[in-house]
């Protein structure tokens, strides 16, 4: 199941996943001036078995000549629940996290990838929080949030973290202090009702969708 909401927001903090549970989807987004190839994948999908997980489908971007602007994707008034993206992060992961069974590590960048990544998390995903640069962490408990299924609905647990305005930054588990570049903004994306078996994306698409037929019926 995909998580219905974004992980909680903590003032002056960002979060990220150290590894991605099987079923996690990553949008194939391209930077300005480029677009997904028409026969290419819409998403990458973390798949695998208990011993090995990897990202299915490759994202491919192609030049779009005169195109130099991005689309205006504006939510309607009733969709005010803000969805967040994450800036592209280094594929380097702490070994103990990325090697978790049933999890994928951060996918490597693809050529002409967008500067932000849009993930669709699944139930059981854990994200870790840290205070942004210039703020210090006051921990009351774990600085993490997990997407859980309760009574048929998904929810994220509340991370026990307060960030106060001091110059020392706290770190994600297993990470060195950041060098020059700041951490990414909060990530993620969502919605509902998915099983990974539904998601046999583009490998067969070129062959099968060419003959795809839509039929409509009046009920």
């Amino acid at each position: 199941e995909l998580c219905d909401d974004d992980p909680p927001e903590i003032p002056h903090a960002t979060f990220k996943a150290m590894a991605y549970k099987e079923g996690t989807m990553l949008n194939c987004e391209c930077k300005r001036g480029f677009r997904r190839i028409k026969s290419g994948s819409l998403y990458m999908l973390c798949t695998g078995n208990s011993s090995h997980s990897s990202w299915d489908n490759q994202c491919q971007c192609t030049s779009s000549a005169t195109r130099n602007t991005t689309k205006q994707v504006t939510p309607q008034p009733e969709e005010q629940k803000e969805r967040k993206t994450t800036e592209m992060q280094s594929p380097m992961q702490p070994v103990d996290q990325a090697s978790l069974p049933g999890h994928c590590r951060e996918p490597p960048p693809w050529e002409n990838e967008a500067t932000e990544r849009i993930y669709h998390f699944v139930v059981g995903q854990m994200v870790y929080y840290q205070c942004v640069q210039g703020y210090r962490a006051l921990h009351r408990g774990p600085a993490e949030s997990v997407c859980k299924m309760t009574h048929g609905k998904t929810r994220w647990t509340q991370p026990q973290l307060i960030c106060t305005g001091e110059m020392e930054t706290s770190q994600f588990p297993g990470e060195e202090k950041p060098q020059a570049s700041p951490e990414g903004r909060p990530e993620s994306e969502t919605s509902c009702l998915v099983t990974t078996t539904d998601f046999q994306i583009q490998t067969e698409m070129a062959a099968t969708m060419e003959t795809s037929i839509f039929t409509t019926e009046y009920q």
Partner: antibody, heavy 113, light 107 residues
Framework: PGSSVKVSCKAS????????ISWVRQAPGQGLEWMGG????????NYAQKFQGRVTITADKSTSTAYMELSSLRSDDTAVYYC???????????????????WGQGTLVTVSS | DIQMTQSPSTLSASVGDRVTITCRAS??????LAWYQQKPGKAPKLLIY???SLESGVPSRFSGSGSGTEFTLTISSLQPDDFATYYC?????????FGQGTKVEIK
């Protein structure tokens, strides 16, 4: 007039769940009008402002079928209703706008008193 | 919503003619534009996407050009099968919108 209609759209020959399915209507002798769409794998539907509150788009992944229900029907809702595949991904809860590369044959809905 | 205006509304031409249809957007849509062909009683068929990319299986006599607010669909040598109505569609903004259509009829 005043009643509802539910039109179905069954996809065959390819992957259904991960692609956006949009509904586009065409009144007799008129142009094309986008009503809204859904990506079945996410279950989240987006609607054109004009139809907000009157249209409900759903999808059943198990049968590769999308549905469009239009309520409070008026005579000017008489039209051919098409479903079409579009290549938008889900971005911040909204289906990224795209073009339509596969179309259903259309269903004529006539609203008369 | 972004308004799309096509011209002309009707175009009379003969087989072999070079035909040009124009589509104007009420604001810049970069190259996020598609062209469709529709015949009576049939669903629209995608011809061109991203303003100038030819859809697979569409004859090369169809071509698209333009960016920003002004776009053109050109049929280099009109064939009997090309008499139909043509629509442009923008997908720059959330609410995709179509032009009112251009009917290409036999002169």
């Amino acid at each position: 007039p005043g009643s509802s209609v539910k039109v179905s759209c069954k996809a065959s020959g390819g992957t259904f769940s991960s692609y956006a399915i949009s509904w586009v209507r065409q009144a007799p002798g008129q142009g094309l009008e986008w009503m809204g769409g859904i990506i079945p794998i996410f279950g989240t539907a987006n609607y054109a402002q004009k139809f907000q509150g009157r249209v409900t788009i759903t999808a059943d992944k198990s049968t590769s079928t999308a549905y469009m229900e239009l309520s409070s029907l008026r005579s000017d809702d008489t039209a051919v209703y098409y479903c079409a595949r579009d290549l938008g991904t889900m971005v911040r809860g909204v289906i990224e706008p795209y073009y339509f590369d596969y179309w259903g044959q259309g269903t004529l809905v006539t609203v008369s008193s | 919503d972004i308004q799309m205006t096509q011209s002309p509304s009707t175009l009379s031409a003969s087989v072999g003619d070079r035909v040009t249809i124009t589509c104007r957007a009420s604001q810049s849509i970069s190259s996020w534009l598609a062209w469709y062909q529709q015949k009576p009683g049939k669903a629209p068929k995608l011809l061109i996407y991203d303003a100038f990319s030819l859809e697979s299986g569409v004859p090369s006599r169809f071509s698209g050009s333009g960016s920003g607010t002004e776009f053109t669909l050109t049929i280099s040598s009109l064939q009997p099968d090309d008499f139909a109505t043509y629509y442009c569609q923008q997908y720059n903004s959330y609410s995709r919108t179509f032009g009112q259509g251009t009917k290409v009829e036999i002169k």
